[in-house]
């Protein structure tokens, strides 16, 4: 049975086996096509989601589709039902929390009272000024809190208490990539992790431990990537994995927060990377223990210089490392998070690519998560 499962796939009506390598090869080998059903699927970027959250205290902004202008949501008459609608528009299914925060002196956007129409937030047409003088601060999910704060050092062994959102993504029980828990159903990782194996069956997620192989595996229901763009082959290195059963959160299994849409990190901002990847470039082996390291944002201009990536780093990517080199992500860390701590931990990047590991002029290149928020929300909404 084990051998059969490993090398063959059972087609139904009529029952017969086909070699497992024929799964997800673009050809219908089973009469009903089920060999092409449970495969990595692409999902288009989709329309603009008409709500977003700002780094200014997680304040809610709403799009006026008629003008294309964004507005800040006034707290006047804001309700739990409106909060739930806003979060559902972003694909969240959990119970949100919200509060009033005073409008700050640097408020740029117009402030409007919010109403609901066809399960979407809208500006109230006839509203007057914002009497409360407050905006809506909205949290769709409790995220980004860990039991332990890491110390700022070079590279060291990590504890799952510090990084409860880190998962190992495995194919045939072998660690392939890292990933981050975003909510009970979803894990964020890199699309390139699935280049070799596009069938969903053999992929598993392991959560809740800092040691490879020492924790139960979770079945995967779907793997979703963005359509490939041949103009920018390294762009869109992002994937979402939907778990078959929702996770139960605990001290060692928790979600990390998505970044805010306006999360612009300046060069030298401190960040963290984690993973079970190779400890030496072109050699060594996977680390059995989760490792963590502090790095910093490297300016994209510097990263694209002639002695570095020569223009290959696009606006949907970011670079991180340390100026003198030596601290970097490596093979096996792919898909894992590049993290920023404000009030909570945010996954601002996904380990994507680089030339070598830890070179001074070629730092790690990461998928910029804020560039894909719209895609993430659209995927989640489609799967609600």
């Amino acid at each position: 049975k084990v051998i059969l499962d490993k090398y063959y796939f059972l087609c139904g009506q009529p029952l017969h086996f086909i070699p497992r390598k024929q799964l997800c090869d673009g050809e219908l080998d089973c009469p009903l096509g089920e060999d092409e059903e449970h495969c990595v699927k692409s999902f288009p970027e989709g329309p603009a989601v008409a709500v977003r959250l700002s780094k200014d205290r997680s304040t809610l902004q709403v799009l006026d589709s008629a003008t294309g202008n964004w507005f800040s949501a006034c707290f006047d008459n804001f309700t739990e039902a409106l909060a739930e609608t806003a979060c559902r528009q972003m694909g969240y299914s959990s119970k949100p929390t919200f509060r009033a925060v005073e409008i700050g002196p640097d408020q740029d956007l117009d402030v409007v009272e919010i109403t609901e129409n066809s399960q979407e937030l809208r500006m109230r047409n006839s509203s007057g000024p914002c009497l409360s003088g407050s905006l809506v601060s909205l949290h769709c999910l409790a995220c980004g809190k860990s039991l332990k704060t890491p110390r700022v050092v070079g590279v060291e062994e990590a504890s799952v208490d510090s990084w409860p959102w880190q998962v190992s993504i495995q194919y045939d029980k072998q660690h392939v990539c890292g990933g981050s828990i975003l909510d009970p159903h979803w894990v964020l990782t890199a699309a390139h992790c699935f280049r070799k194996h596009t069938d969903v069956f053999n992929w598993k997620v392991r959560a809740g431990s800092d040691k490879l192989g020492s924790f139960p595996s979770l079945a995967v229901a779907k793997i979703i990537i963005i359509e490939f763009n041949p103009m920018y082959p390294k762009d869109n290195d992002i994937a979402l994995m939907k778990l078959q059963f929702p996770l139960t959160f605990s001290g060692t299994v928790r979600p990390i927060c998505l970044p805010f849409f306006d999360e612009e990190l300046t060069p030298a901002t401190p960040l963290w990377i984690i993973g079970w990847g190779f400890t030496k470039q072109n050699g060594g082996k996977m680390s059995d223990i989760l490792l963590q390291a502090s790095v910093q944002v490297i300016d994209s201009t510097r990263c694209n210089a002639d002695d570095a990536y020569q223009g290959e780093v696009t606006e949907k990517m970011m670079c991180a490392g340390i100026p003198e080199g030596g601290v970097d992500t490596c093979q096996g860390d792919s898909g894992g998070p590049l993290m920023y701590q404000s009030d909570q931990w945010h996954v601002v990047g996904i380990v994507s690519w680089g030339y070598g590991c830890g070179g001074p002029s070629t730092p790690g290149v990461y998928t910029k998560v804020s560039a894909y928020l719209n895609w993430i929300y659209n995927v989640w909404k489609a799967e609600l």
Epitope: I103, P105, P129
Partner: antibody, heavy 120, light 107 residues
């Protein structure tokens, strides 16, 4: 574009009242607070009070309490400032100024000003 | 009430000069501060809000800084059209109050 057009200059006797108008256009009148500021000849700016054009609610500086009344006519998008019991020190240019949708916002548009002269 | 004190009350400068005007609040106002420019016979015009944010359409030679009680308006290279009176305004609490103004004159 946003415009605030004020009524013309007035000459008043001490003890009289004056009513200055400010007609707004180019934006949603009811959504933004309106303020009144005055400036005596050769002097600085002095804030008098605010009005919510949607509800008609007002707030006045202590100095003008009991003497100033701010009203509005939503059908013509016009706000009015009436100052009573005029004295010579009320001689000033009176400005209406548009705020934003919250009270602690700066004044992004101003009327051209209305000179009120109080003289016997 | 919060008192706003500007200095100097007037200054003479030439085209191309760097000009700095200061404004001090009698108590902390965080960054609830705006700067206005007023030319003779005209209404004031908003230049800066939130102490350092440039109002749309205002030339970038104008900049603001400060927080708490001490604030500065800087004109990096004075232009002929910049000769005017400048006022700071606190928006931290009501009643809203203005500084007494700083007149920038041609040397």
């Amino acid at each position: 574009q946003v415009q605030l057009v004020q009524s013309g200059a007035e000459v008043k006797k001490p003890g009289a009242s004056v009513k200055v108008s400010c007609k707004a256009s180019g934006y949603t009148f009811s959504r933004y607070y309106m303020h009144w500021v005055r400036q005596a000849p050769g002097q600085g700016l002095e804030w008098m009070g605010w009005m919510n054009p949607n509800s008609g609610d007002t707030g006045y500086a202590q100095k003008f309490q009991g003497r100033v009344t701010m009203t509005r006519d939503t059908s013509t998008s016009t706000v009015y400032m009436e100052l009573s019991s005029l004295r010579s020190e009320d001689t000033a240019v009176y400005y209406c100024a548009k705020g934003r949708e919250w009270l602690r916002s700066p004044f992004d548009y101003w009327g051209q000003g209305t000179l009120v002269t109080v003289s016997s | 009430d919060i008192q706003m004190t500007q200095s100097p009350s007037s200054l003479s400068a030439s085209v191309g000069d760097r000009v700095t005007i200061t404004c001090r609040a009698s108590q902390s106002i965080s960054t609830w501060l705006a700067w206005y420019q007023q030319k003779p016979g005209k209404a004031p015009k908003l230049l800066i809000y939130a102490a350092s944010s440039l109002q749309s359409g205002v030339p970038s030679r104008f900049s603001g800084s400060g927080s708490g009680t001490d604030f500065t308006l800087t004109i990096s290279s004075l232009q002929p059209e910049d000769f005017a009176t400048y006022y700071c305004q606190q928006l931290s609490s009501y009643p809203l109050t203005f500084g007494q103004g700083t007149k920038v004159e041609i040397k």
